[in-house]
């Protein structure tokens, strides 16, 4: 299995409002070179949730240290979940390009559902 595969194991994750949601994703290879991004939804209207390369994403933290050499785990945690966060999240590998990076492979998605906050 030489070609990079995206491992996005959970089909569904359920989180109570106010809690954090962990979305798991890993790659089977470091090649090709290029960033990982997380999106909510698919297609043209998808929403960028996290970009490994650039940007400020105050509610998102990486589960593993992404600067660590040979790291293949690109799981993220999203804090203070609200019902508006519900949707399907995709972990996407991009290939470094010029001028723009090119989408290379996507995970199969993880559906995030939000439960009411326990009283």
């Amino acid at each position: 299995e030489d070609e990079l595969q995206v491992i996005q194991p959970e089909k569904s994750v359920s989180v109570a409002a106010g809690e954090s949601a962990t979305l798991r994703c890993a790659m089977t290879s470091l090649i090709p070179v290029g960033p990982i991004m997380w999106f909510r939804g698919a297609g043209a209207g998808r929403e960028l949730i996290y970009n490994q390369k650039e940007g400020h994403f105050p509610r998102v933290t990486t589960v593993s240290e992404l600067t660590k050499r040979n790291n293949l785990d690109f799981s993220i945690s999203i804090s203070n979940i609200t019902p508006a966060d519900a949707g399907t999240y995709y972990c996407v590998k991009f290939r470094k390009g010029s001028p723009d990076d090119v989408e290379f492979k996507s995970g199969a998605g993880t559906e995030l559902s939000v439960r009411a906050k326990p009283s």
Epitope: Q5, I7, Q8, K11, A26, A108, G109, E111
Partner: antibody, heavy 123, light 113 residues
Framework: QVQLVQSGAEVKKPGSSVKVSCKAS????????ISWVRQAPGQGLEWMGS????????NYAQKFQGRVTITADESTSTAYMELSSLRSEDTAVYYC????????????????WGQGTTVTVSS | DIVMTQSPDSLAVSLGERATINCKSS????????????LAWYQQKPGQPPKLLIY???TRESGVPDRFSGSGSGTDFTLTISSLQAEDVAVYYC?????????FGGGTKVEIK
């Protein structure tokens, strides 16, 4: 072709622990899930938990939480299942199995199984 | 946890006849993003580990004879052996692969009448 070879039969005393190994050969190890399933004599199949070595952390059935530990050693392509505080009801055949993975990283079923390890708990 | 209920517990069928096993899940195992049902069927013969027969509710694993077929969606599934052979005597299990823990049905024993 991937093969899973498990460690041999064990006889244990109540209250003790058992650690069963599962060595994979013939394929990639780190990006596949390894699940553990047990089967008590004359009973059905019971999923205990699984690990995807690339993530390192395991996922357990609530029933076994706190009593089972699943680990993986990527350097030897070996998964381990340790069950503690053994009781007679833990007498069973314990299987490891590799979870088949589709494009995009979802798992769909256990496509390769170990031969099973019989654990007998008796005083 | 998703509860998987299989019926019947046992089934005796004449050689060459059809065998039908049902499996019901307590909640849907259909993943809407790819329209796949994460439901697997296994065959287990005495003294052997289980063998994967069908995944995604209806996709036969490589090498599985075409007399085995799976159908259903959402919460209701069926495994059919179209023409029972002597080597099909075994216990059959369904398992949902949608949400952890990946629970099994209780099993259906298929025998020859």
């Amino acid at each position: 072709q991937v093969q899973l070879v498990q460690s041999g039969a064990e006889v244990k005393k109540p209250g003790s622990s058992v650690k069963v190994s599962c060595k994979a050969s013939g394929g990639t190890f780190s990006s596949y899930a390894i699940s553990w399933v047990r089967q008590a004599p004359g009973q059905g199949l019971e999923w205990m938990g699984s690990i995807i070595p690339i993530f390192g952390t395991a996922n357990y059935a609530q029933k076994f939480q706190g009593r089972v530990t699943i680990t993986a050693d990527e350097s030897t392509s070996t998964a381990y299942m340790e069950l503690s505080s053994l009781r007679s009801e833990d007498t069973a055949v314990y299987y490891c199995a590799r979870d088949g993975r589709e494009y995009g990283g979802h798992y769909y079923g256990m496509d390769v199984w170990g031969q099973g390890t019989t654990v007998t708990v008796s005083s | 946890d998703i509860v998987m209920t299989q019926s019947p517990d046992s089934l005796a069928v004449s050689l060459g006849e059809r065998a039908t096993i049902n499996c019901k899940s307590s909640q849907s195992v259909l993943y809407s993003s790819n329209n796949k049902n994460y439901l697997a069927w296994y065959q287990q013969k005495p003294g052997q580990p289980p063998k994967l027969l069908i995944y995604w509710a209806s996709t036969r694993e490589s090498g599985v004879p075409d007399r085995f077929s799976g159908s259903g969606s959402g919460t209701d599934f069926t495994l059919t052996i179209s023409s029972l052979q002597a080597e099909d005597v075994a216990v059959y299990y369904c398992q949902q692969y949608y949400l952890s823990p990946f629970t099994f049905g209780g099993g259906t024993k298929v025998e020859i009448k």
